[in-house]
Interface confidence: low
């Protein structure tokens, strides 16, 4: 349905509040270094322009595309060249190349200061003084640090952020009320950002077909009673939504996501019995709820898959007639029967099935050739099952912190060229799989663990892509989306790595460590552990454990000392010397 003015169409569909919020997110995700005030000014100008188009769709420039309007606006920023360097060259291009250029300059790890949380009273005062500015600032700060954050979902987070302040700033104990809510929003926000980053990487690096395959598998697990054609329709619509958001088309994305939620709720009888509660909620909550809804029960009497996909004499005919449709049906039928499998495993099985048909349908006796295809699935299923079993046992034995340390050592030995902050961040997140997934029963462990690991390893891939330092990381990240985790799991110690020169400064600590939160203190220790492994990649677990135990004792001792700084200086030297001796540095 063509509209004379796209900007007027979206303004009317979304309403002024959501329109302004989404334009702010879009601008902050593109120009991540721009001050808040500059963005607010640009958003206000765009909003005023949109209102003129709503009043008269034939008014000057109202017929321009959103990319043209937004790009023109971004290119009016005076300090573009000084602040963003070569990104300013994007402004010399025409649409659609200009937007593509802006997208390529999105920075997953922007050089921005860490967000420090002010005192609760300070935040509550700011909230009461100017609620609108306070909430806009939240959108801006999250969007510029997470340039691929799912925009309509960020509106949902902002709604919860506002609700937390509204409730807690009038509570008797403001801090007790507010801080746990903010911690929860922060943790959920990081997880949401990482999940969306994988969707965008899937679309941008591996194409629409890869994303659609992921979506068929996931939606078939979630809606096993829905028809294949119904699932296909949802996949098509969902792909459009995510393509738009990942492409910076946030107004279209939010609008289409709302339409999709509406469709799902109007057709829930033929989709899932689990949607009722979600569909009674307001729009933002509804969309979030649908995205997180539990899997529906599997139909009781599903026939064997072998009949249609192995035993039928028409397998090759059906495959040849419509390859992607037939493979889609295979993936749908397999996924709806296996909520206990990870999506990436289901995609590996579908790939194996496709490869077998490609080979066998050209053979003299196709049926004889593909008759045992399901036998090839067994090792693919057992590999993640065994890996999860072993790692959950290790997690239960060690606890989260020490399990993270085991992974830090494992991954530093695999890819020692990767920067220490990245190794610490990624290994800490990999380690969280234990507390997130190992508590689940067997039937839920694999989808929880392996699909979570896909999200975390994608963080490694996007951070590494910015400054590539390891061919092994590049290989695992680019060869196959669904085999990233097995690829990293299969990596052994990098024998080509030349150990890092020893630098005492890396292992010099000060009294400020004593005032850090437990989490920050862990990160300091884990940073030291990575550096140790980089200096001595052949160090044994026992050697590293001994050094880390000494280090923990040293920190504890000096933090209890009267003269902390002197203790850190003197005892630190002894610790470095003892560690060097222990590791033979």
């Amino acid at each position: 349905d063509a509209h004379k003015s796209e900007v007027a169409h979206r303004f009317k569909d979304l309403g002024e509040e959501n329109f302004k919020a989404l334009v702010l997110i879009a601008f902050a995700q593109y120009l991540q270094q721009c001050p808040f005030e500059d963005h607010v000014k640009l958003v206000n100008e765009v909003t005023e322009f949109a209102k003129t188009c709503v009043a008269d769709e034939s008014a000057e420039n109202c017929d321009k595309s959103l990319h043209t309007l937004f790009g023109d606006k971004l290119c009016t920023v005076a300090t573009l060249r000084e602040t963003y360097g070569e990104m300013a060259d994007c402004c010399a291009k025409q649409e659609p190349e200009r937007n593509e250029c802006f997208l390529q300059h999105k920075d997953d790890n922007p050089n921005l200061p860490r967000l420090v949380r002010p005192e609760v009273d300070v935040m509550c005062t700011a909230f009461h003084d100017n609620e609108e500015t306070f909430l806009k600032k939240y959108l801006y700060e999250i969007a510029r640090r997470h340039p691929y954050f799912y925009a309509p979902e960020l509106l949902f987070f902002a709604k919860r952020y506002k609700a937390a302040f509204t409730e807690c700033c009038q509570a008797a104990d403001k801090a007790a009320c507010l801080l746990p809510k903010l911690d929860e929003l922060r943790d959920e926000g990081k997880a949401s950002s990482a999940k969306q980053r994988l969707k965008c990487a899937s679309l941008q690096k591996f194409g629409e077909r890869a994303f659609k395959a992921w979506a068929v598998a996931r939606l078939s697990q979630r809606f096993p009673k829905a028809e294949f054609a119904e699932v296909s329709k949802l996949v098509t619509d969902l792909t459009k939504v995510h393509t738009e958001c990942c492409h910076g088309d946030l107004l279209e994305c939010a609008d289409d996501r709302a339409d999709l939620a509406k469709y799902i709720c109007e057709n829930q009888d033929s989709i899932s019995s689990k949607l009722k509660e979600c569909c009674e909620k307001p729009l933002l909550e509804k969309s979030h709820c649908i995205a997180e809804v539990e899997n529906d029960e599997m139909p009781a009497d599903l026939p064997s898959l072998a009949a249609d996909f192995v035993e039928s004499k028409d397998v090759c005919k059906n495959y040849a007639e419509a390859k992607d449709v037939f493979l889609g049906m295979f993936l749908y039928e397999y996924a709806r029967r296996h909520p206990d499998y990870s999506v990436v495993l289901l995609l590996r099985l579908a790939k194996t099935y496709e490869t077998t048909l490609e080979k066998c349908c050209a053979a003299a006796d196709p049926h004889e050739c593909y008759a045992k295809v399901f036998d090839e699935f067994k090792p693919l299923v057992e590999e993640p099952q065994n890996l999860i079993k072993q790692n959950c046992e290790l997690f239960e034995q060690l606890g989260e912190y020490k399990f993270q340390n085991a992974l830090l050592v494992r991954y530093t030995k695999k890819v020692p060229q990767v920067s220490t902050p990245t190794l610490v961040e990624v290994s800490r997140n990999l380690g969280k799989v234990g507390s997130k997934c190992c508590k689940h029963p067997e039937a839920k462990r694999m989808p929880c663990a392996e699909d979570y690991l896909s999200v975390v390893l994608n963080q490694l891939c996007v951070l590494h892509e910015k400054t590539p330092v390891s061919d092994r990381v590049t290989k695992c990240c680019t060869e196959s989306l669904v085999n990233r985790r097995p690829c990293f799991s299969a990596l052994e110690v990098d024998e080509t790595y030349v150990p890092k020169e020893f630098n005492a400064e890396t292992f010099t600590f000060h009294a400020d460590i004593c005032t850090l939160s437990e989490k920050e203190r862990q990160i300091k220790k884990q940073t030291a552990l990575v550096e140790l492994v980089k200096h001595k990649p052949k160090a044994t677990k026992e050697q590293l454990k001994a050094v880390m135990d000494d280090f923990a004792a040293f920190v504890e001792k000096c933090c209890k000392a009267d003269d902390k700084e002197t203790c850190f200086a003197e005892e630190g030297k002894k610790l470095v010397a003892a560690s060097q001796a222990a590791l033979g540095l």
Epitope: S232, P299, E321, V325
Partner: nanobody, 115 residues
Framework: QVQLQESGGGLVQPGGSLRLSCAAS????????MSWVRQAPGKGPEWVSA????????RYAESVKGRFTISRDNAKSTLYLQMNSLKPEDTAVYYC????????GSQGTQVTVSS
């Protein structure tokens, strides 16, 4: 939007015949295998019969073999089920579905076999 509309049901005496039709729209009918599923009062859905996309390969549940015939007309995007020698135990709501599936995405048509 995917739509499946069944028709042709009704009340019939034991030993009688009915022909059910299912008009499909909103997807490429000729690319998909199709099935008939039925649900008797108070029971779960039961798969009845399936046909591949081209119409060459047909399958039947043991309970209907030799009495029911599934067919399709891809030009008309319509699926059929010819039901002969009907028995009281065939009484159910009949649904057409995409793929070999026992899930229901449509309204169905009531078939009652009674004297």
């Amino acid at each position: 939007q995917v739509q499946l509309q069944e028709s042709g049901g009704g009340l019939v005496q034991p030993g009688g015949s009915l022909r059910l039709s299912c008009a499909a729209s909103g997807f490429t009918f000729g690319s998909f295998g199709m099935s008939w599923v039925r649900q008797a009062p108070g029971k779960g859905p039961e798969w009845v019969s399936a046909i591949d996309s081209g119409g060459a390969d047909t399958r039947y549940a043991e309970s209907v073999k030799g009495r029911f015939t599934i067919s399709r007309d891809n030009a008309k995007s319509t699926l059929y089920l010819q039901m002969n020698s009907l028995k009281p135990e065939d009484t159910a709501v009949y649904y057409c579905t995409i793929g070999r599936s026992s899930s229901r995405g449509s309204q169905g048509t009531q078939v009652t076999v009674s004297s």
